[in-house]
């Protein structure tokens, strides 16, 4: 079925929501004053070999649990990330965006990445897809 303007708009809004969530996480942790940043950077994330289509979000979905574990280190009294809620929200968006009709086997790059590189990769992906929709 060809995408309608309303489905495109919905996809765009969901991608924008995903983008904002990822940027919020990145801004929250990627601060040179963050006491835990260096230790957070010791965690490794798998990066997609290719990420150009919505189905490739499968690769993000598979790394959400490790992401939540690292985010558990990022809380402070004045910075309430609420990792479980945040990851749950991202998971819902990812599932809607990639669809559940086709099962896609994610292919990962050989090199692992830090949380900052990982977030930047998926932020770039979201921005790229949004730009093709507008």
């Amino acid at each position: 079925m060809a995408p309608t303007s309303s489905s495109t708009k919905k996809t765009q809004l969901q991608l924008e929501h995903l983008l904002l969530d990822l940027q919020m996480i990145l801004n929250g942790i990627n601060n040179y004053k963050n006491p835990k940043l260096t230790r957070m950077l010791t965690f490794k994330f798998y990066m997609p070999k290719k990420a150009t289509e919505l189905k490739h979000l499968q690769c993000l979905e598979e790394e959400l649990k490790p992401l939540e574990e690292v985010l558990n280190l990022a809380q402070s009294k004045n910075f309430h990330l609420r990792p479980r809620d945040l990851i749950s929200n991202i998971n819902v968006i990812v599932l809607e965006l990639k669809g559940s009709e086709t099962t896609f086997m994610c292919e990962y790059a050989d090199e692992t990445a830090t949380i900052v590189e990982f977030l930047n990769r998926w932020i770039t992906f979201s921005q790229s897809i949004i730009s093709t929709l507008t």
Epitope: N34, K36, T38, R39, T42, F43, K44, Q75, K77, N78
Partner: antibody, heavy 121, light 111 residues
Amino acid sequence: EVQLVQSGAEVKKPGESLKISCKGSGYAFTNYLIEWVRQMPGKGLEWMGVINPGSGGTYYNEKFKGQVTISADKSISTAYLQWSSLKASDTAMYYCARWRGEGYYAYYDVWGQGTTVTVSS
Amino acid sequence: AIRLTQSPSSFSASTGDRVTITCKASQSVDYQGDSYMNWYQQKPGKAPKLLIYAASNLESGVPSRFSGSGSGTDFTLTISSLQSEDFATYYCQQSNEDPYTFGGGTKVEIK
């Protein structure tokens, strides 16, 4: 019981290599970072570096970078601190410690008993 | 690196005494409303033991006579009534910035 058990005391000559160990038990070893701390005779405590046993990712105190190597084998829940060429100034007590960083905190809640390293010709 | 200066470096006290140890940081160890300052106790030939974390939180199993306070650059460890098992060296530690650093230690001896 959560514990970190370190390898025994070592007496070495300058220029020799050495690898000391720290074995975790009573908890999920890959869920916590392991840090190494040096205490020279009659002195205070110095942080050396940290390893994430799950990923193998490390971060070192600039002072110790290139002087020591921190590694881990998650299959046997063990972290290591090694020297390729010991110096007399490496004579010290070395402790491993478990880092806790959830929530608003960052501290060492469990320590190994320490490994005494003596380097003398 | 953040320097931590403990005072006094050593002193003598009697059981039952109220003991206060201070730790002054060369710059603030606070981040977004939290103080990244911890206190450890070390006895001769033993590993350090965590007493207080995040400036004022008592570690599980540590007697309530130990307490911590402070924020920014000035912190205090207080032992409300010194017991015989409390004679040891106490270290403050900041975990706000790498490299983590420890104070020089305060040795509490029997008078």
